[in-house]
Amino acid sequence: MKVLQEPTCVSDYMSISTCEWKMNGPTNCSTELRLLYQLVFLLSEAHTCIPENNGGAGCVCHLLMDDVVSADNYTLDLWAGQQLLWKGSFKPSEHVKPRAPGNLTVHTNVSDTLLLTWSNPYPPDNYLYNHLTYAVNIWSENDPADFRIYNVTYLEPSLRIAASTLKSGISYRARVRAWAQCYNTTWSEWSPSTKWHNSYREPFEQHHHHHHHHHHH
């Protein structure tokens, strides 16, 4: 039994790091393998992760961590019974994939403005809480070409857009994801999408003089 692709890990910089690897043949990861991990620090204990299968020869393990600081370094040992298959280390702060934002809501109660809000996936004591920026993806269910991304580079988890920038009378979906420049993270997964019906009334003057204006965006 050999490791074909060495473990690579990403951290949510809060409580979970996920490591994936491939074996040289079909493997029952949970019965045949164990990934031992230990924070390189005083009093730290070794922990055992039981991997799950991820395709025929692939394995994935979710390493649970109490907290994380920038300087953290973990030793990783992959065992098959008494045989050490691979030994490595992992610095969570160098391989961060943020948690996905949640609770995406579209507020349509102001006729000419759409307000999208979502929740920061981190608690205030986490460094990433004040360092996330977001990308909001809005698309039309009717028209695949009507697909847009808004970059939210301020810290507030919200986005205001004029309803008139979208077509009226059709359904749209939105989703949001996060990243943090400070740790050069990858993007998070997208949040679950939310759906709304876009309808707005053009001002009378605009309707009278520029009836087709909004079709030209």
């Epitope: 809060m14 409580s15 979970i16 620090f41 005083l42 009093l43 649970l64 961590m65 109490d66 907290d67 600081v69 920038s70 300087a71 953290d72 981190y122 608690p123 205030p124 004591d125 460094y127 004040n130 400070c182």
Partner: antibody
Framework: EVQLVQSGAEVKKPGATVKISCKAS????????MHWVQQAPGKGLEWVGR????????IYASKFQGKATITADTSSNTAYMELSSLRSEDTAVYHC?????????WGQGTLVTVSS | DIVMTQTPLSLSVTPGQPASISCRSS???????????LEWYLQKPGQSPQLLIY???NRFSGVPDRFSGSGSGTDFTLKISRVEAEDVGVYYC?????????FGQGTKLEIK
Amino acid sequence: EVQLVQSGAEVKKPGATVKISCKASGFNIKDTYMHWVQQAPGKGLEWVGRIDPTNGYTIYASKFQGKATITADTSSNTAYMELSSLRSEDTAVYHCVSRRPWFAYWGQGTLVTVSS
Amino acid sequence: DIVMTQTPLSLSVTPGQPASISCRSSQSIVHSNGNTYLEWYLQKPGQSPQLLIYKVTNRFSGVPDRFSGSGSGTDFTLKISRVEAEDVGVYYCFQGSHVPYTFGQGTKLEIK
């Protein structure tokens, strides 16, 4: 041996500023969060705030926001807390504590007395 | 802020007898990562506090096994199975799950 050694007792006048230090040995402060805890005379423990020494990220209890400023110097392995606009109510013992992820190591405490 | 309320505030126990201290949080202290960071500290007279129990039930290294922690949700308990003279001092519960972190008001244990 792991130790947190704090600077000595201070007596200050109201309105003054004091900066107390906490030097760690036996471990690197970059590997922990460094916290400060207040203990007023004859009273209990109150959490002041904390710092991640590597990136300087601080959080404070609202009571100490604007009153306490926590800093760290990783080259000297030392954490600091500055208390400004001192009042008699700030008279207390202040403990530095390393947390990873519990308060395993405490400094001996620094008594700050505010008196005119 | 989460308020940690300890009862009783003082306790007088005969050596060899058990002691129990209760700590109630004003709301759940389960962290977003699923862990409950409820700890117990003992401050002996003239000393800095020392860690006894972390994550509700785990004894810190070197802590005698007569100390045990239990509880979940918002109700937690520290038990000393047989009190010894060296156990005197003030016991504090602490929650490190939600900012601002908070201590209980302390329970003073003395020997009869």
